[in-house]
Interface confidence: low
Amino acid sequence: NQDLPVIKCVLINHKNNDSSVGKSSSYPMVSESPEDLGCALRPQSSGTVYEAAAVEVDVSASITLQVLVDAPGNISCLWVFKHSSLNCQPHFDLQNRGVVSMVILKMTETQAGEYLLFIQSEATNYTILFTVSIRNTLLYTLRRPYFRKMENQDALVCISESVPEPIVEWVLCDSQGESCKEESPAVVKKEEKVLHELFGTDIRCCARNELGRECTRLFTIDLNQTPQTTLPQLFLKVGEPLWIRCKAVHVNHGFGLTWELENKALEEGNYFEMSTYSTNRTMIRILFAFVSSVARNDTGYYTCSSSKHPSQSALVTIVEKGFINATNSSEDYEIDQYEEFCFSVRFKAYPQIRCTWTFSRKSFPCEQKGLDNGYSISKFCNHKHQPGEYIFHAENDDAQFTKMFTLNIRRKPQVLAEASASQASCFSDGYPLPSWTWKKCSDKSPNCTEEITEGVWNRKANRKVFGQWVSSSTLNMSEAIKGFLVKCCAYNSLGTSCETILLNSPGPFPFIQDN
């Protein structure tokens, strides 16, 4: 049909920080390059219907559905979604094509479905159909990488069986300890699956996709390093591959390495060796021990021996299921207002955990650090001296763990007062929890020293605000004190704070803070 306009349908994916998204849908937007959705005429449909390729969007992503119409004259349009009409403002680009856009901000389930665009031009009417669905991230996986030897090459392949396919990178470091942190200049990253340089101090492989990043370290025994005070321990689940690297440096080639499991030589085919010169003409040898799929009987002490170095061992433990070992009893802490303090959890876990710290329904990133004794530690210092309940939550593929902490900040009470026709109440959040006194101010007692004991009702810790206890004291009004000034005082080991209340007949009550 010669009258039909030339139509192009595109999808624009916006970056999360795209500040231009959300302006009127007729505005051009800075974003990723548009993806052609190839609008094709739908066969056997009543009327002229173009159908765009189905669009899959991540939850919370922001997109624009855009139609470019090459047709003479003006156009008018209407969007319809789930039987509702939506505003449509066409504009014209530099090539004088009509441009119609639909912006979907922060995609949710309710925004998925069919979007119909009705366009009326001077020549003809037609409909464009977009089907938008949320990408099924339930099918997404991110599995920890594992190693395989490359056939007939002295190289390791890093494999992560993940969906969508991950980007794999090797993270290499040739110095010791702290300087091998990811951001350190000593760290080299190689975005490739195969690694030939296997002599480095610290070798990790990482895989990342939409779900995050997972890393596996090549477990290494270095015969030139002083052994750890506790035996290094490696956990694996049944069926996983085992890789241990033994590394040694000597002044010349006259040495060899061997692996033993529980004092028996490792079976043939379960090891291979590499060696190289280092810059100062010394010789580096490495000997890999590997088992492609471990069973329970692969548990034991793996010892690397050398003809020129003291041997060293590692304990390999094969488990049926992953675990998180830590004490889950809740812990209470009491600190001064300016005291430096961090919560910490010491745990042993396999596979590695993902964790969060939570306070007041807000989650904070969780860092974990490996200790020499096979344990890991996570610390949280960013509490800003806010009292309350802090929660550490950790999980891996097979286990979950939660631990509660309460932080109390020692401080003098602060008193707030409120009054009604029948009673006056005072509240305080000081710590340790305060005790209360009520005093009546009268001609006989201008300094408010006359203590009130009748009609006082103290409630300690009656309200828990994110774990922060609040103490209150209520005075029921009697004829004896109506019309008088009364003073409520909260006191603890750090000081006293008072508030003065005029017990009037009903109406606004003035409060006088008196510290």
Epitope: K149, D154, L257, E273, M274, S275, S305, S306, S307
Partner: nanobody
Framework: QVQLQESGGGLVQAGGSLRLSCAAS????????IDWYRQAPGKQREWVAQ???????HYEPSLKGRFTISRDNAKNTAYLQMNSLKPEDTAVYYC?????WGQGTQVTVSS
Amino acid sequence: QVQLQESGGGLVQAGGSLRLSCAASGSTFSRNYIDWYRQAPGKQREWVAQITSAGNTHYEPSLKGRFTISRDNAKNTAYLQMNSLKPEDTAVYYCRILDYWGQGTQVTVSS
């Protein structure tokens, strides 16, 4: 357990050639490095050459050019081809895989 057996040694005139063999038992041969060493009477054992599992070769710099190391994974055997032999090459030659050593084969070069 890997077992290694060297052969091919003998008496040869200076300037002559010999080809040493190192036969290994066990399936581990193809995935490991093989080193040749030698020990002259009254001297320390010294490294001669190495061939990696991928077939890359390394030599003691002073021997490069005269000696060639090779391997045949199908036969589980490594070789050391020695040309232009000199009297100072006289020694017992050993091959090594991992920490396993052969018994050695005597090479004597007469002037």
